[in-house]
């Protein structure tokens, strides 16, 4: 009886694992083995596929074959007993194009209200992704074990910290990798769960802001308690993206070590041009807080994010404020080619009660003012990218008197 060729051959490639699966054509014939050959592009001869010769099952692994993953190859299979079937040719394919990204390795560390996630590729020193290792980004799904309500977080790197969690609570998550340059989305990791710790006695510092004054950076933050000391650390933002980096080398800022106030001032030349991450930690001598949320700090934006310049047109019950580009020395306007949002603070000259308006537009109406009353206005600009969190210093306050009643037109 003639042996039939095997059919329905599937090639599964995950990272550097090459797996072949196929269907027997004739289940009734026993003791059949299967063998594969492969052929590289531009070659006439077929070569025996090592790892896939005389296979008794319907699956084989040819991961040991050192292929150029960007080069097209062709496979063929036949069944063998006393005689052999005809060859069945599999559609040619390029390993890299066919490959899927395997599940990443995930390691979790718990804080009281945060989880640190360390992610690394599932296959170390992968041949498949050798040229793309630095391009991996990850996404994750996280949920409270008790509720199951999922939150997705996209576009993270090999170390990510999730904040604003609840103490003593179990969270579960799974992570998958992506190579956006090749339109590849990977397979999710197994689910990992971890319980956040008991709430720390000292909370981390909050609301970190950087501004420029003269030739210095001024770093400010908020803190709940008095009589504390603080330290500030920085990290090159790009180091976070590096998958080979297991130790993030946060560095100290000399003028921000053991400061007793909720701000520190240091020379601009401490940082070269670039994007940095900053974090602050509090200590009372016995206990130490966890680190604050990290803020992104771009020296280019920070240096040139100047306070806005504005004109006020006074009416009886409102101000019309027209915001213009800030002026640099020499009175020439600064071109700021990134979107800004404006924070306008105003108050009655005789009172300390401030009111705030946030606007994207450069013409703003301040409503509900009293006639013939002096109001003061100051403004500052913020970048609209939440992560960059850049703010200019406030402009000098400008005070104007509203017009008498019935001049609102």
């Amino acid at each position: 009886k003639n042996l039939k060729s095997p059919q329905k051959v599937e090639v599964d490639i995950i990272d550097d694992n090459f797996i072949l699966r196929w269907n027997r054509s004739d289940e009734s014939v026993g003791n059949v083995t299967f063998s594969f050959d492969y052929q590289k592009t531009g070659m006439d001869n077929w070569i025996k596929l090592s790892g896939c010769q005389n296979i008794t099952s319907t699956k084989c692994n040819f991961s040991s074959l050192k292929l150029n993953v960007y080069e097209e190859i062709k496979l063929r299979i036949r069944a063998e007993k006393e005689n052999t079937s005809s060859w069945y040719e599999v559609d040619s394919f390029t390993p890299f194009r066919k490959a899927q990204i395997g599940p990443p390795e995930v390691h979790l560390e718990a804080e009281d209200k945060a989880i640190v996630i360390h992610i690394s590729p599932g296959t170390k020193d992968s041949v498949m992704w050798a040229l793309d290792g630095l391009s991996f980004t990850y996404s994750l799904v996280i949920w409270k074990n008790s509720s199951g309500v999922e939150e997705r977080i996209e576009n993270i790197y090999s170390r990510h910290k999730i904040y604003k969690l609840s103490p003593e609570t179990t969270y579960c998550l799974k992570v998958k990798a992506a190579l956006l340059t090749s339109w590849k989305i990977g397979v999710y990791s197994p689910v990992h769960c971890i319980k956040t710790t008991v709430e720390n006695e000292l909370p981390p510092p909050e609301n970190i802001e950087v501004s420029v004054q003269n030739q210095n950076y001024v770093l400010k933050w908020d803190y709940t308690y008095a009589n504390m000391t603080f330290q500030v650390q920085w990290l090159h933002a790009f180091l976070k993206r590096n998958p080979g980096n297991h130790l993030y080398k946060w560095k100290q800022i000399p003028d921000c070590e053991n400061v007793k106030t909720t701000q520190c001032v240091f020379p601009q030349n401490v940082f070269q041009k670039g994007i940095y991450l900053l974090r602050v930690q509090a200590s009372d001598g016995n206990n130490t807080s966890f680190w604050s949320e990290e803020i992104k700090f771009d020296t280019e934006i920070q240096a040139f994010l100047l306070p806005p310049v504005f004109n006020i047109r006074s009416l009886s019950d409102s101000f019309h404020i027209y915001i213009g580009a800030p002026k640099q020395s020499g009175n020439t306007p600064v071109i700021q080619d990134y979107p800004l949002i404006y924070e306008i603070i105003f108050w009655e000259n005789t009172s300390n009660a401030e009111r705030k308006i946030i606007e994207k537009k450069t013409d703003v109406t301040v409503p509900n003012l009293k006639p013939l009353t002096v109001y003061c206005v100051k403004a500052r600009a913020h970048t609209m990218d939440e992560k960059l969190n850049k703010s200019s210093v406030f402009s000098d306050a400008v005070c104007e008197k509203t017009k008498p009643g019935n001049t609102s037109k």
Partner: antibody, heavy 118, light 106 residues
Framework: QVQLQQWGAGLLKPSETLSLTCAVY????????WSWIRQPPGKGLEWIGE???????NYNPSLKSRVTISVDTSKNQVSLKLSSVTAADTAVYYC????????????WGQGTTVTVTS | AIQLTQSPSSLSASVGDRVTITCRAS??????LAWYQQKPGKTPKLLIY???RLESGVPSRFSGSGSGTDFTLTISSLQPEDFATYYC????????FGQGTRLEIK
């Protein structure tokens, strides 16, 4: 003035374990990364691995399977162990401190010559 | 691991010469690069950190520049005590050193 003082066995037989210690005198231990570097005779510098004061480590992938670096914060000491040595491990071994303010190894130990011979 | 390739491997120069040594990284390392000087039988000495910052106590004739993959160490006017071997080193992930550049008297 911070000083790093190194010591350990200088003569080893193949397959033995190299063991070196580096003590930090006159300066703070925490907040720094501590590296071990070696230099075979007449050759360049090769980084072995590093550790921070909390014990987190990072190793040269080519040596990772044989290297253990540890810290004893109570003594301000860093230790290096390299198992299954061969003649290729013959070198001057240095410990060095990475600045806590910038990326550079700013303080070095005096170096320990280790020879592996049968 | 990131490879650092220094060029030249050795060079001869005279006192007073301006000398430039280059260091090329196999992938971008931003500015996390340092330069060291080592004299025979001595420990390496840090000259430049963060690619272009001069270490305290190092003469100003030494300077560093570059970012990304290409870096240079320049000695503006060679002094007799500058004849030594120079190494670059990156801190991007696993630390690696360049193979060294031997600077000898012409």
């Amino acid at each position: 003035q911070v000083q790093l003082q190194q010591w350990g066995a200088g003569l080893l037989k193949p397959s033995e374990t190299l063991s070196l210690t580096c003590a930090v005198y006159g300066g703070s231990f925490s907040g720094y990364f501590w590296s071990w570097i070696r230099q075979p005779p007449g050759k360049g510098l090769e980084w072995i691995g590093e550790i921070d004061h909390s014990g987190k480590t990072n190793y040269n992938p080519s040596l990772k399977s044989r290297v253990t670096i540890s810290v004893d914060t109570s003594k301000n000491q860093v230790s290096l162990k390299l198992s299954s040595v061969t003649a290729a491990d013959t070198a001057v071994y240095y410990c060095a401190r990475e600045s806590k303010y910038y990326f550079g190894l700013d303080v070095w130990g005096q170096g320990t010559t280790v020879t592996v011979t049968s | 691991a990131i490879q650092l390739t220094q060029s030249p491997s050795s060079l001869s120069a005279s006192v007073g010469d301006r000398v430039t040594i280059t260091c090329r990284a196999s992938q971008g390392i931003y500015s996390v690069l340092a330069w060291y000087q080592q004299k025979p039988g001595k420990t390496p000495k840090l000259l430049i950190y963060d690619a272009s910052r001069l270490e305290s106590g190092v003469p100003s004739r030494f300077s560093g520049s570059g970012s990304g993959t290409d870096f240079t160490l320049t000695i503006s006017s060679l002094q007799p005590e500058d004849f030594a071997t120079y190494y670059c080193q990156q801190f991007n992930s696993y630390i690696t050193f360049g193979q060294g550049t031997r600077l000898e008297i012409k």
